[in-house]
Amino acid sequence: YSHWPSCCPSKGQDTSEELLRWSTVPVPPLEPARPNRHPESCRASEDGPLNSRAISPWRYELDRDLNRLPQDLYHARCLCPHCVSLQTGSHMDPRGNSELLYHNQTVFYRRPCHGEKGTHKGYCLERRLYRVSLACVCVRPRVMG
């Protein structure tokens, strides 16, 4: 990542400490998962990519942050509240729910580095975990005890 402008510590700095500082708390995505606001159809296609052929189809929504590497991440957004029938590809089956599958991805944030007396010394990359929704899966509803 050294091609990012001023991203690297000054000479003599310990890169293992300054460049990669762990934070184990996953950063939530910019927006929570929400019902689809755009009129893309709740149906399983017979061809096309996996996300449109799935019985829990989803679309991808861009999450861009220019102070993060990677700058572009894509979050899955379920197109249907329930699973789609394998037979018709269009009728929803209320016996199954369409739910997001999450993954904690390692990302790096660009942060100002500070010298011994609080002076600004370029930028450091801070390693974080970031929660990304990868796909929607068809699951049996939880039975509340």
């Epitope: 996300n51 861009l62 894509y74």
Partner: antibody, heavy 122, light 107 residues
Framework: EVQLVESGAEVKKPGASVKVSCKAS????????MNWVRQAPGQRLEWMGL????????SYNQNFKGRVTLTRDTSASTAYLELNSLRSEDTGVYYC???????????????WGQGTLVTVSS | DIQMTQSPSSLSASVGDRVTITCSAS??????LNWYQQKPGKVPKLLIY???SLHSGVPSRFSGSGSGTDFTLTISSLQPEDVATYYC?????????FGQGTKLEIK
Amino acid sequence: EVQLVESGAEVKKPGASVKVSCKASGYSFTGYTMNWVRQAPGQRLEWMGLINPYNGGTSYNQNFKGRVTLTRDTSASTAYLELNSLRSEDTGVYYCAREDYDGYLYFAMDYWGQGTLVTVSS
Amino acid sequence: DIQMTQSPSSLSASVGDRVTITCSASQGISNYLNWYQQKPGKVPKLLIYYTSSLHSGVPSRFSGSGSGTDFTLTISSLQPEDVATYYCQQYSKLPYTFGQGTKLEIK
């Protein structure tokens, strides 16, 4: 040579929908994000949204309140803009624009379609 | 959304003049700013990206500068073919937003 060719002018009634196409050639269609920008008569350029043709990922300008849908057909190297619930204020020229990206510093619309004039009138 | 404001809205200058257009962002956008040129009845064209980098094929009389909230587009020696409307655009945060444009005419 990179080219973006948009569909022809449209005249629509208020409440109707319009679908504009943008056929790309001269580059790898799935390798570049496609933006859609509107220009109402005498107004500033207004960004409507973008689509990544590789995975269909989108980002929309919420000012359009969910009336915009962006799709693509990778086999035809074509991006589509659909705008629903049209009103007279939607009259304007609609441009598709390819977005160049260097990986860390810039995102810039380097090639533009010729524009599609959409007129909304009763 | 980040608001972009250009000044002046229009200006008239003579061939050979040095012309300056400014663009102000409602919050800091680092150097994440592009400039576009739109000639009358034509499609917008990318002029400058990342505040100061000239797009390929753009004459060297065009230059850009600034950082944070205040940016400048300069034409060192105005030519007749520079008659156009110029727009700044931020890409620091989605949604992308444009300035209202500066219409440049020849005296």
